[in-house]
């Protein structure tokens, strides 16, 4: 696993402990919380990042209408169970034996149950809609400039292959970024859209996961883009299974 050799840190994940104990004295980094080795040349999986976060000390209408099956992460933080590859286990349980099924981005997709709850497979989130509202600017952003800047950001900062940024919509002051990645499209080594979206979310919140970086401050043709609000919608390959009681709430 590559890491900055000179001072042995992980450029893509500050929530790690690194030491030169890899093969040939190479720098090796392990995620806090899980102790799993991470590849510092790419993004760390959201599951390992959430686990590390929980272990850390506490300190004309062009816009897309989210589908009726779109999930929003309303449950907040929890200490997840990750598989040996760092992915979310399909079933998550808390210390009081309350269990639920999650999708590949760790968002609950069923009602909560007990230990008898079965989650047969980890359902893939194949479509993510990032909905941003920006603060007033000197003028509306040029759509093509905004599109280019956001695509550049996901390509360069998050190392997400450009083909997975399906669209950038803009209707002042709302910006929507659509990420799409089916199981069949994702090749070995490709960054997962869920991981890229999580890094982006943390950047926007001023909690960058990259080593030695502050929050993400975007500029489009020099114009500061100050984000007022962020909502992220997750669409799974198989619709979620919630009881009617929740759907009508």
């Amino acid at each position: 696993h590559t890491a900055a050799q000179d001072n042995c840190t992980c450029p893509t994940n500050k929530m790690t402990v690194c030491s030169p104990d890899g093969p040939g004295g190479r720098c090796q980094c392990r995620a806090l919380g899980s102790g799993m080795a991470v590849d510092c040349s790419t993004l760390t999986s959201k599951c390992l990042l959430l686990k590390a976060r929980m272990s850390a000390p506490k300190n004309a209408r062009t816009l897309v209408r989210p589908s009726e099956h779109a999930l929003v992460d309303n449950d907040g933080l929890y200490d997840p169970d990750c598989d040996p590859e760092g992915r979310f286990k399909a079933r998550q349980c808390n210390q009081t034996s309350v269990c639920w099924c999650v999708n590949s981005v760790g968002v609950r997709r069923t009602d909560k149950g007990d230990l008898s709850l079965r989650c047969d497979e980890l359902v893939r989130t194949h479509h993510i809609l990032i909905d941003l509202r920006h603060r007033p600017t000197a003028g509306a952003f040029n759509h093509s400039d905004l599109d280019a800047e956001l695509r550049r950001l996901f390509r360069e900062r998050y190392r997400l292959h450009p083909k997975f940024v399906a669209a950038v919509h803009y209707e002042q002051p709302t910006i929507q970024i659509e990420l799409r990645q089916n199981t069949s499209q994702k090749a070995a080594g490709d960054v997962d859209i869920g991981d890229a979206a999580y890094y982006f979310e943390r950047d926007i919140k001023g909690e960058s996961l990259f080593q030695g970086r502050g929050g993400l401050d975007l500029r489009v043709r020099g114009e500061p883009l100050q984000v007022e609000r962020t909502l992220i919608y997750y669409l799974d390959e198989i619709p979620p299974k919630f009881s009617m009681k929740r759907l009508t709430a």
Partner: antibody, heavy 119, light 106 residues
Framework: QVQLVQSGAEVKKPGASVKVSCKAS????????IHWVKQKPGQGLEWIGY????????KYNEKFKGRVTITRDTSASTAYMELSSLRSEDTAVYYC????????????WGQGTLVTVSS | DIQMTQSPSSLSASVGDRVTITCKAS??????LAWYQQKPGKAPKLLLY???SLETGVPSRFSGSGSGTDYTLTISSLQPEDFATYYC????????FGQGTKVEIK
Amino acid sequence: QVQLVQSGAEVKKPGASVKVSCKASGYTFTTYVIHWVKQKPGQGLEWIGYINPNNDGTKYNEKFKGRVTITRDTSASTAYMELSSLRSEDTAVYYCARPHFETHAMDYWGQGTLVTVSS
Amino acid sequence: DIQMTQSPSSLSASVGDRVTITCKASEDIFNRLAWYQQKPGKAPKLLLYGATSLETGVPSRFSGSGSGTDYTLTISSLQPEDFATYYCQQYWNTWTFGQGTKVEIK
């Protein structure tokens, strides 16, 4: 290296106008906005507004709207801040500033221009 | 507008002292906080941005911490050249500065 050089001190009478310039060098002028910041003698800093040299767009602090006009001349890599209907409380040092390359904080500052309003 | 309240407004300290200045925002600014140092007759100088990131060339005795609405600038061991006025600034929603903290020689 990045430099912002401002015009010299001005003494003006109440009711007059003043135009302060800020010449940028060492970077592509249209890449970053130019902010203007006011500092009254012995007091704190107050953001006035900015201009985006790329498209001439401006954004102002509500407090200064109406009396302040920020303009630019891209061929001269210069931004201007004009303040009209001057009064004694406009006596201050006015700074231009450029953002940091990866944040919206202000990294490079001009040396400041003292504007004195006195009858 | 977001208000930034800095405290104390002034403090007296000696060379070698540990100095702490706090800044409170009227709402969550999501770590979009910068700290500046200003000496008499000079323009402000950026010390830290993103609440914790040290600007290039700034000595490591300066550090920042905090989140949400509460932020702190710490000078671990005050040096003679550190006697100055310090300002916090938020850049989450336009730009506003704290009223400043003057660090004087005891």
